[in-house]
């Protein structure tokens, strides 16, 4: 047993059908020594006396909120709450396997440049009595500063007969060095607990490797006279690391017909414009990654080429 | 919101077997754990067994270790209850429950109900 915060206990339950479970000692906290009594949550049958409870802690039913009394005044609240192992894991009930980029995918995060600012996501399936913590360090050993707001609800979508939530938050590293070479990864810590379940969920990382930039800006076509070519302009993201001529891009141009089973055009460049022929009713997209590392691209941006 | 309905229940004699059903709709039916509880006239209402989502764990109250069976199908939406070696003191009315918690043997634990399906094992 650990203390998640004050009042909150962590029981870690080895669960297996006729486990004996464990053995857990609360203790009031008063002075008073005689006379007090204890129940569990809302229910006004009493559990033991004394200053001390023992219980067995075996499944949810044994989880809540014990409450310590003395002649119907509350002396102390200890909420329980059960982390459970099967089969030697720990369970992942409350988030779902995002499954990308491989299985037990539950913590995703990208970063749109080098300054040490990134973003985690991850998805529910549940909708009430829902907490969420979140802890960030550079390294594990000696860990350095990570500071991370709250996760907040930032999305809702439906699949099939399923509501589906998507969960977010910001982490910027305190003494992040964008030019630096990582040697440490970042770790990320997500503490859920819904109801009288808790679970903890990690995601370890080189900001380089969750580097996802923004799409180019200001995507312009310039016709070129007498001919169906034309010049694709853009820009950099604003959120990009500068400067550009050491945090480089490099783009890839996309000219797609109307019909997604037309051949597609592309053209790689480094540069921010690139001649291409324009065909009718078709788009011209442009996306960016990182020139000197392979992490992912951005998404497109597009203009079509009327 | 999840609906949910039993089936399966009726008159046996003592050491029949009957099979209840619990049909849920109007949810995703493999997102919840399942509970069987029964409740006598004048009685509490008490826990009977539970099965976890994937249906691969399931957890018992003692007087039906042994007799009674829980299983799910989770491409039918629905979880059943096999009872077996039937006593007198079986008689109940039958609920099952859907919750996020497993194992857990307190119906406020539960928070999707049937309306039940009434047993009765005579002698």
């Known amino acids: 047993i650990w203390e998640l915060k004050k009042d909150v206990y962590v029981v870690e339950l080895d669960w297996y059908p006729d486990a004996p479970g464990e053995m857990v000692v609360l203790t009031c906290d008063t002075p008073e020594e005689d006379g007090i009594t204890w129940t569990l949550d809302q229910s006004s049958e009493v559990l033991g006396s004394g200053k001390t409870l023992t219980i067995q802690v075996k499944e949810f039913g044994d989880a809540g909120q014990y409450t310590c009394h003395k002649g119907g005044e509350v002396l102390s609240h200890s909420l329980l709450l059960l982390h459970k192992k099967e089969d030697g894991i720990w369970s992942t009930d409350i988030l779902k396997d995002q499954k990308e980029p491989k299985n037990k995918t539950f913590l995703r995060c990208e970063a749109k440049n080098y300054s040490g600012r990134f973003t985690c996501w991850w998805l529910t399936t549940i909708s009430t009595d829902l907490t969420f913590s979140v802890k960030s360090s550079r390294g594990s050993s000696d860990p350095q500063g990570v500071t991370c707001g709250a996760a907040t609800l930032s999305a809702e979508r439906v699949r099939g007969d399923n509501k589906e939530y998507e969960y977010s938050v910001e982490c910027q590293e305190d003494s992040a060095c964008p030019a630096a070479e990582e040697s440490l990864p970042i770790e990320v810590m997500v503490d859920a607990v819904h109801k009288l379940k808790y679970e903890n969920y990690t995601s370890s990382f080189f900001i380089r490797d969750i580097i996802k930039p923004d799409p180019p800006k200001n995507l312009q076509l310039k016709p070129l006279k007498n001919s169906r070519q034309v010049e694709v302009s853009w820009e950099y993201p604003d959120t990009w690391s500068t400067p550009h001529s050491y945090f480089s891009l490099t783009f890839c141009v996309q000219v797609q017909g109307k019909s997604k089973r037309e051949k597609k055009d592309r053209v790689f460049t480094d540069k921010t414009s690139a001649t291409v022929i324009c065909r009718k009713n078709a788009s011209i997209s442009v996306r960016a990654q990182d020139r000197y590392y392979s992490s992912s691209w951005s998404e497109w941006a597009s203009v079509p080429c009327s | 919101e999840v609906q949910l309905v039993e089936s399966g229940g009726g008159v046996v004699q003592a050491g029949e077997s009957l099979r209840l059903s619990c049909a849920a709709s109007?949810?995703?039916?493999?997102?919840?754990?399942m509970g069987w509880f029964r409740q006598a006239p004048g009685t509490e209402r008490e826990f009977v067994g539970t099965?976890?989502?994937?249906?691969?764990?399931?957890y018992y109250e003692d007087s039906v270790k042994g007799r009674f069976t829980i299983s799910r199908d989770n491409a039918k939406n629905t979880v059943y209850l096999q009872m077996s070696s039937l006593k007198p003191e079986d008689t109940a009315n039958y609920y099952c429950?859907?919750?996020?918690?497993?194992?857990?043997?307190?119906?406020?634990?539960?928070?999707?109900w049937g309306q039940g399906t009434q047993v009765t094992v005579s002698s």
């Open positions: 099965i976890n989502r994937r249906g691969s764990s399931t």
């Open positions: 109007g949810g995703s039916f493999s997102n919840y754990e």
């Open positions: 429950a859907a919750g996020w918690l497993y194992p857990s043997s307190r119906s406020r634990d539960y928070d999707y």
